[in-house]
């Protein structure tokens, strides 16, 4: 679709004659008629195929003709055309004089013809004019012509239809030879499509505008390319959505069971030993004058036994004090007026002079202990098991019974189930009083994650085309993530080519 | 137990500014993205802003862009949504959610009451 | 963005009924939906998320199904805790969107 269009320039007929010889009466009132058609050879009568149109009365005789863009007696004349340019034309363009109406002389009777001329040949599109001027015996014609393409039509013959537009069907303006020139930030055939954040995960993230990014369900952060965890998650992490990968300390299936109840509560008190033990359990081993669950609880300040040689002990408010038995003195008791001569070593114990006679020193067998060998040695008094171990007396020894998971003379040490890597299929480990329990990534279960859940959606592979499969907040559930060129909830259907242009 | 306490509501005229926090426990705060929803008297909910758990990369609905913004101090275990410009149509009960713009909100607070009246 | 319609808007039942409110999508949601309760001056709880999964602690007579565009929250026999006011939520697309409410009443 374009426009032909001829600029008039200057007529001349200084006789002012008529073709036919004749004289015009009083001058030729000139006017013009235009036809404009396919390319002839040799140009014949018929129908103006490309066009024709008529002018007003221009001038008399011999007159210059001025542009003129509105109103009657246009100049350049438009010749609209509504097909493909096909680069070559007939002109044949005829000066008429009439007796009649100015404006419109074409309808006037007794009009007579000045003079005409024929032109064929080859006309690109283009803004340029072509100048021509034709002369015969009487008159003479300066003129120029063109052909452009009407508005939101392009290319060398104006068939390409380009309407520039920024809304839902697109976001382009138009180049010289009607290609789409997408506006900023857009992209695709008909620049439809959104250029996203620069580094915006390309199946994770989606745009629909551009330097956006909006993440897919199950992904976060700027770029898309950080995982959400399990919304049930209480103190875990994930490396894919909806996983709940645990915090140190913590375990079970969402992360909500403390196996470091220690740290997290510090519930011993008064300098306690806190050891755990498994979920939310663990043992305070209290310091010497507590005791109690948590060792919350004073024990008397006699409780510890500090009077010596067979003192008795007595409870003041903030101290104590030891009623010694005869022969001995001191704060604990723990000073002698006896010598070996008294025999004071009992349980076999043997005596030994100290200070030139004034005191002894008893040395005890083994299993035996105190001034004079009266205790009999608990091996047990100094909570020597860690981690909740039992105490037992083994005559001259003592042993330590420990609680399953621990290990070690003293029960110091943990027994990690874990070591030995029992869970499969990339399952996360967590140690309890129990044994060993795995949380299972998506598509599998059972106590090692060693099955495979056979209703993990995207193991019937449900999606097409190359689509990308993703389960849900559930293994049954999932989400094909197209390609560019599809779409369906599973990417079946070709996105189909518009049927024609929606402007 | 998971818990989220909002506070900082209150009266405030149009134009306005007001400063919500929300007091996170019960969860590892820092591994998780928060929201704000809100509820005008007597209608529905709607999202209005979330944040990312470790960039706090934030995400703001287009009714409030360019008005609000959405925070958060991981160290205090805290959410906050600073509200300027503020209009009348804002008035609603604000909501603290754990949750994501792409994820179910999990977990709500109580709410607090913001009301924006000359 | 989408929008999310919930049917009906209020609802009568008595304790022991089965009830179902619907949801509809404007666009296809996959199975990014989830649902809510609320109860008067309350916040709102989480029920049901990716479309039928039991959020933790809710009664298994809560079920929701569906897929798509078109989604359905059930509660086999109500109980007189369940008259609250239930929402639908789309995550599917940003932004998230939710139903305008079902009030559910006692008869």
């Known amino acids: 679709s374009g426009i032909f269009q001829l600029r008039l320039q200057e007529f001349a007929n200084e006789r002012g004659m008529l073709a036919n010889g004749r004289p015009c009466e009083p001058g030729c009132r000139t006017f013009f008629r235009i036809c404009l058609k396919h390319y002839q050879a040799t140009f014949s009568e018929g129908p103006c195929t490309f066009g024709n149109v008529s002018t007003p009365v221009l001038g008399t005789n011999s007159f210059v003709i001025r542009d003129k863009n509105s109103g009657s007696g246009r100049n350049p004349l438009q010749l609209p055309f509504n097909f493909t340019w096909p680069g070559t034309f007939s002109l044949n363009i005829q000066a008429w004089h009439t007796p009649g109406d100015d404006l419109r002389p074409e309808t006037s009777p007794g009009n007579s013809l000045i003079s005409q001329i024929i032109i064929q040949g080859s006309l690109a599109v283009g803004k340029n004019w072509k100048s021509d001027e034709q002369n015969n015996t009487l008159t003479r014609l300066r003129y120029s012509y063109r052909v452009v393409c009407s508005d939101n039509y392009y290319g060398d013959s104006c068939s390409r239809l380009c309407k520039k537009r920024d809304d839902h069907f697109g976001h382009y303006e138009c180049q010289p030879d009607g290609s789409l020139s997408c506006l900023p930030g857009w992209t695709g055939k008909y620049c439809d499509q959104p250029i996203c954040l620069s580094g915006c995960h390309e199946q994770n993230g989606y745009c629909s505008k551009p330097d956006e990014c909006n993440c897919r369900p199950g992904w976060q952060g700027p770029l898309c390319n950080e995982c959400i965890p399990h919304n049930g998650c209480r103190h875990g992490t994930c490396t894919i959505p909806w996983q709940c990968a645990c915090d140190e300390g913590w375990g079970g299936l969402f992360c909500d069971q403390d196996l470091n109840y220690c740290t997290h509560h510090s519930p011993c008190k008064n300098g306690s030993t806190c050891s755990n033990s498994g979920p939310r359990g663990y043992t305070c081993t209290c310091l010497p004058g507590y005791t109690g669950e948590h060792c919350e609880l004073e024990l008397s300040k006699c409780a510890s036994n500090p009077c010596r040689n067979g003192g008795s002990c007595k409870d003041h408010e903030n101290s104590y004090h030891c009623l010694c038995p005869p022969g001995y003195y001191g704060q604990h008791c723990e000073h002698s007026t006896l010598t070996c001569a008294d025999s004071p070593c009992f349980n076999g114990g043997s005596c030994r002079e100290r200070n030139q006679g004034a005191s002894y020193a008893c040395e005890c067998p083994p299993n035996f202990t105190g001034s004079n060998c009266e205790k009999k040695v608990d091996r047990c008094t100094s909570n020597p098991c860690a981690n909740g171990g039992q105490c037992l007396n083994r005559g001259p020894s003592r042993t330590c019974r420990c609680r399953p998971g621990f290990t070690g003379t003293h029960c110091e040490l943990h027994i990690s189930d874990c070591a030995r890597s029992p869970c499969a299929h990339g399952g996360t480990c967590h140690d309890l009083e129990n044994g060993p329990v795995c949380t299972c990534p998506a598509g599998f279960s059972g106590r090692r994650c060693e099955v495979r859940i056979t209703n993990d959606a995207c193991a019937s592979g449900p999606c097409f085309n190359g689509a990308t499969c993703y389960t849900g907040l559930s293994p049954n559930n999932f989400v094909c993530n197209c390609p560019y060129g599809f779409v369906g909830s599973r990417c079946e259907f070709p996105v189909g080519l518009p049927p024609s242009f929606p402007w | 137990e998971v818990q989220l306490v909002e506070s900082g509501g209150g009266l405030v005229q149009p134009g306005g500014s007001l400063r919500l926090s929300c007091a996170a426990s019960g969860f590892t705060f820092g591994n998780f993205p928060m929201s704000w929803v809100r509820q005008a008297p007597g209608k529905g909910l709607e999202w209005v802003a979330s944040?990312?758990?470790?960039?706090?990369?934030?995400t703001i609905g287009d009714s409030v862009k360019g008005r609000f913004t959405i925070s958060r101090d991981n160290a205090k275990n805290s959410l906050y949504l600073q509200m300027n410009s503020l209009r009348a149509e804002d008035t609603a009960v604000y909501y603290c959610s754990r949750g994501y713009y792409n994820s179910p909100f999990a977990y709500w607070g109580q709410g607090t009451l913001v009301t924006v009246s000359s | 963005d989408i929008q999310m319609t919930q049917s009906p808007s209020s609802l009568s039942a008595s304790v022991g009924d089965r009830v179902t409110i619907t949801c509809r999508a404007s666009e296809d949601i996959y199975s990014n939906l989830a649902w809510y309760q609320q109860k008067p001056g309350k916040a709102p709880k989480l029920l049901i998320y990716?479309?039928?999964n039991l959020a933790d602690g809710v009664p298994s007579r809560f079920s929701g199904s569906g897929s798509g565009t078109d989604f359905t929250l059930t509660i086999s026999s109500l109980q007189p805790e369940d008259f609250a006011t239930y929402y639908c939520q789309q995550y599917n697309n940003y932004p998230p969107t939710f139903g305008q409410g079902t009030k559910l009443e006692i008869k």
């Open positions: 944040i990312s758990s470790s960039d706090s990369w934030a």
């Open positions: 990716d479309t039928n």
